[in-house]
Interface confidence: low
């Protein structure tokens, strides 16, 4: 791995074990300035594999509201708009992390949680099996 | 939004005011336990609008490495395994959140930080101006 | 606990009609796409129709083709089989399965419901 | 839209194992990798035992496995056990219909 040397000015660490406890500033830096927020709003209707959106909530997690992406067909839909079953739509899933309140209901102590979200559908051929 | 009455077990938070700093623990905690790993592996070369992982690596940023899908083509393959113009492969981008270093090269004092990462791709039709 | 309860199901002559219908419960029934499934008596399993998690694709085999329509209402998390035009053949146990959209593969199902068409 | 074929019956001995074959054409078993397996006892609902050919289901014990070669799909029950005694069907995906199931296998544990 690549190491850095430590900034003189950091904040002191009380606990060097693991599992360690970090501060975290929760006045979160946006990088995606750069970014089209329209761009893929309506790819999910668009899309030969198309998905529907459903709303997760927690408020004893960070952020609280979570977006799941469910493809509405087990095919994909063909040029004729009809839903072809030789091939496949399926969810493309991704780890992201998020911060759980540790103890529960308090408002300055979290714990990381990796979880796996559905964020769009894709189209794929099934898993066909090649005989040698 | 829900109020939860706060736990009497919390630590204490010097700071009341945003941008807020708040504890967390690295140690984590992996909810995806009744996911198959092999699920979404081979999606990126089955998919009509396949793509290719590029790997972002960041030594001041927690996780250290996102892996960022780049679509290959700028049309899907159709079923003669030809690329095809009248539709699109296009990336589904989802904003994640990672904890950025700050002050910089510091072990234990983070910000949180929101990324746009590009998690796959899906095969969109086009949007057709029609001209009066 | 996830589970799905058929009802609707009974005695009709041929040539008649019946709604089934199939309560979902202990899950996020708008999440997943569904399938009605009959086995005749002592006979095997066989497909009989697909509805997609939103509604808006379905599928049927081809011996209930023009005879039966499935619908859903996720609000109510319920599944419905209309089946019109009912034949000897058609008389079977209906179960309701869910299928999520990983794989074509039936994880969770109905304890079925008995349709007896006769005269 | 035929049914798979699967053998009536089959019996074993109580720790033994037993394998039950399912087989199909190039147009479901042979081309997809989209074969299940379903256990069902007398009067009750199937139960997913196997999907995408080799996987099994949380909860479904690892006495049951599945294999494919060529067209043919199996499920084999390793250390059979009186509560195996059931009714197994094998399903696939199909390249006209989403589903066709197999007539289904009697196993009886002698």
């Known amino acids: 791995g690549i190491t850095i040397p430590r900034n003189p000015g950091c904040p002191n660490s009380e606990d060097k074990n693991f599992p360690r406890t970090v501060m975290v500033n929760l006045n979160i830096h946006n990088r995606n300035t750069n970014t089209n927020p329209k761009r893929s709003s309506d790819y999910y209707n668009r899309s030969t594999s198309p998905w529907n959106l459903h709303r997760n909530e927690d408020p004893e997690r960070y952020p609280s509201v979570i977006w799941e992406a469910k493809c509405r067909h087990l095919g994909c839909i063909n040029a004729d708009g009809n839903v072809d079953y030789h091939m496949n739509s399926v969810p493309i899933q991704q780890e992201i992390l998020v911060l759980r309140r540790e103890p529960p209901h308090c408002p300055n102590s979290f714990r990381l949680e990796k979880i796996l979200v559905s964020v769009g559908c894709t189209c794929v051929t099934p898993i066909v099996h090649h005989v040698a | 939004g829900i109020t939860i009455p706060r736990n009497p077990g919390c630590p204490n938070s010097e700071d009341k005011n945003f941008p807020r700093t708040v504890m967390v623990n690295l140690n984590i905690h992996n909810r995806n336990t009744n996911t198959n790993p092999k699920r979404s592996s081979d999606y990126y070369n089955r998919s009509t609008s396949p793509w290719n992982l590029h790997r972002n690596e960041d030594p001041e940023r927690y996780p250290s490495v996102i892996w960022e899908a780049k679509c290959r083509h700028l049309g899907c393959i159709n079923a003669d395994g030809n690329v095809d113009y009248h539709m699109n492969s296009v990336p589904i981008q989802q904003e994640i959140l990672v904890l950025r270093r700050e002050p910089p090269h510091c072990p234990n004092s983070f910000r949180l930080e929101k990324i746009l990462v590009s998690v796959g791709c899906t095969c969109v039709t086009p949007i057709v101006h029609h001209v009066a | 606990e996830v589970q799905l309860l058929e009802s609707g199901g009974g005695l009709v002559q041929p040539g008649g009609s019946l709604r089934l219908s199939c309560a979902a419960s202990?899950?996020?029934?708008?999440?997943?796409?569904m399938i009605w499934v009959r086995q005749a008596p002592g006979k095997g399993l066989e497909w009989v129709s697909y509805i997609g998690s939103s509604g808006g694709q379905t599928v049927y085999a081809d011996s209930v083709k023009g005879r039966f329509t499935i619908s859903r209402d996720n609000s109510k998390n319920t599944l419905y089989l209309q089946m019109n035009s009912l034949r000897a053949e058609d008389t079977a146990v209906y179960y309701c399965a869910r299928v999520p959209d990983y794989y074509y593969g039936m994880d969770v199902w109905g304890q079925g419901t008995t349709v007896t068409v006769s005269s | 839209q035929s049914a798979l074929t699967q053998p009536a019956s089959v019996s074993g001995s109580p720790g033994q194992s037993i394998t039950i074959s399912c087989t199909g054409s190039?147009?479901?078993?042979?081309?997809?990798?989209?074969v299940s397996w379903y256990q069902q006892h007398p009067a009750k609902a199937p139960k997913l035992l196997i999907y995408?050919?080799?996987h099994r289901p949380s909860g479904v014990s690892n006495r049951f496995s599945g294999s494919k070669s060529g067209n043919t799909a199996s499920l084999t029950i390793s250390g059979l056990q009186g509560e195996d005694e059931a009714d197994y069907y094998c399903?696939?995906?199909?390249?006209?219909?989403?589903?066709?199931f197999g007539g289904g296998t009697k196993l009886t544990v002698l």
């Open positions: 995408e050919v080799t």
């Open positions: 202990g899950f996020t029934f708008s999440h997943y796409h």
């Open positions: 190039s147009d479901d078993v042979g081309r997809y990798d989209y």
């Open positions: 399903s696939s995906h199909t390249s006209t219909s989403p589903w066709v």
